[in-house]
């Protein structure tokens, strides 16, 4: 009889341990959920405030059609410029058409005047071909005027209404580009 009671007691104790474990797991799960909830709420808040502003481009960016452009206020070499754009979820400007080139040069005239701005164009050291950063070739009307006689890597930049080339290690302003947010309305 005593053995039976002690077996029951052990079973009860085991059950209690399991319940305690379950409770601990539940508490942990609840805490995790609360954290996730906080995170989601913060994300929603950001999304809502962005939606409330309903601007397809971030502050200080310029919109044209499906693109947003950022004209830097600092100088950097071409590679650093690219990284600065990536930090903002963008890449160096890739000019797809004469219309886009005209918009960019027109905007620059209004903003800053005649400075040099890196764009996402570089010359392959082996083949000498000009390529945009995504690997595509520029259209014939958008090839840089031959200007750089550099033995180093050569990159493209915009000045006034021209596309020119220069040693990638020189310091210039730069232009970033990202897609404009589509309005879901």
């Amino acid at each position: 009889k005593l053995l039976q009671v002690s077996t029951i007691a052990m079973q009860q104790q085991e059950k209690l341990i399991q319940q305690e474990r379950a409770l601990l797991n539940f508490t942990e799960w609840k805490r995790s959920c609360a954290l996730q909830m906080k995170y989601c709420q913060a994300f929603m808040q950001n999304s809502l405030s962005s939606a409330h502003n309903s601007s397809p481009c971030p502050n200080n960016w310029i919109q044209n059609r499906e693109s947003c452009y950022y004209v830097s206020e600092i100088w950097s070499i071409w590679h650093t410029s690219q990284e600065n754009c990536l930090k903002e979820g963008s890449t160096l400007l890739q000019i797809e058409s004469k219309e886009e080139m005209d918009f960019i040069t027109g905007s620059l005239r209004k903003i800053k005047g005649s400075y040099d701005y890196w764009v996402g164009l570089s010359q392959d050291g082996h083949s000498g071909r000009w390529l945009w950063q995504d690997g595509s070739s520029p259209s014939p009307g958008l090839l840089p005027a031959e200007r750089s006689q550099s033995a180093n890597q050569v990159c493209g930049y915009v000045k006034s209404n021209s596309l020119l080339s220069s040693n990638c290690s020189t310091w210039k302003y730069f232009i970033c580009e990202k897609y404009a947010l589509r309005s879901s309305v």
């Epitope: 994300f43 990536l86 930090k87 979820g89 963008s90 890449t91 950063q133 995504d134």
Partner: nanobody, 115 residues
């Protein structure tokens, strides 16, 4: 904080292919772009390829047409598909997450291309 875990490196013959993966965890909502780097001259790291959240890509000249960067948002993972590999592609490849305030690096994965 953002944690990055690379995988997919290994030994391959020249002309072969490899696919590197970089899985991100932690504060992933702060990530704006992700990229792959490898060593360059003078103890620097060069950006091999990168992809922004909206899918824009950038590649270093030497890999254009051979490497392709892509992302799977559901898995918070970025991939680097490396085709037509050359012995000069041999290197440690690091994954990097770009946020507005800070950059995060993975531990790196070794790629060796034998001739």
């Amino acid at each position: 904080q953002v944690q990055l875990q690379e995988s997919g490196g290994g030994l391959v013959q020249a002309g072969g292919s490899l696919r590197l993966s970089c899985a991100a965890s932690g504060s992933i909502l702060s990530i704006n772009s992700m990229g792959w780097y490898r060593p360059a001259l003078g103890n620097q790291r060069e950006l091999v390829a990168a992809i922004t959240n909206d899918g824009r890509t950038t590649y270093v000249d030497s890999v254009k047409g051979r490497f392709t960067i892509s992302r799977d948002n559901a898995k918070n993972t970025v991939y680097l598909q490396m085709n037509s590999l050359k012995p000069e592609d041999t290197a440690v490849y690091w994954c990097k997450a770009f946020t507005r305030d800070k950059d995060y690096w993975g531990q790196g994965t070794q790629v060796t291309v034998s001739s």
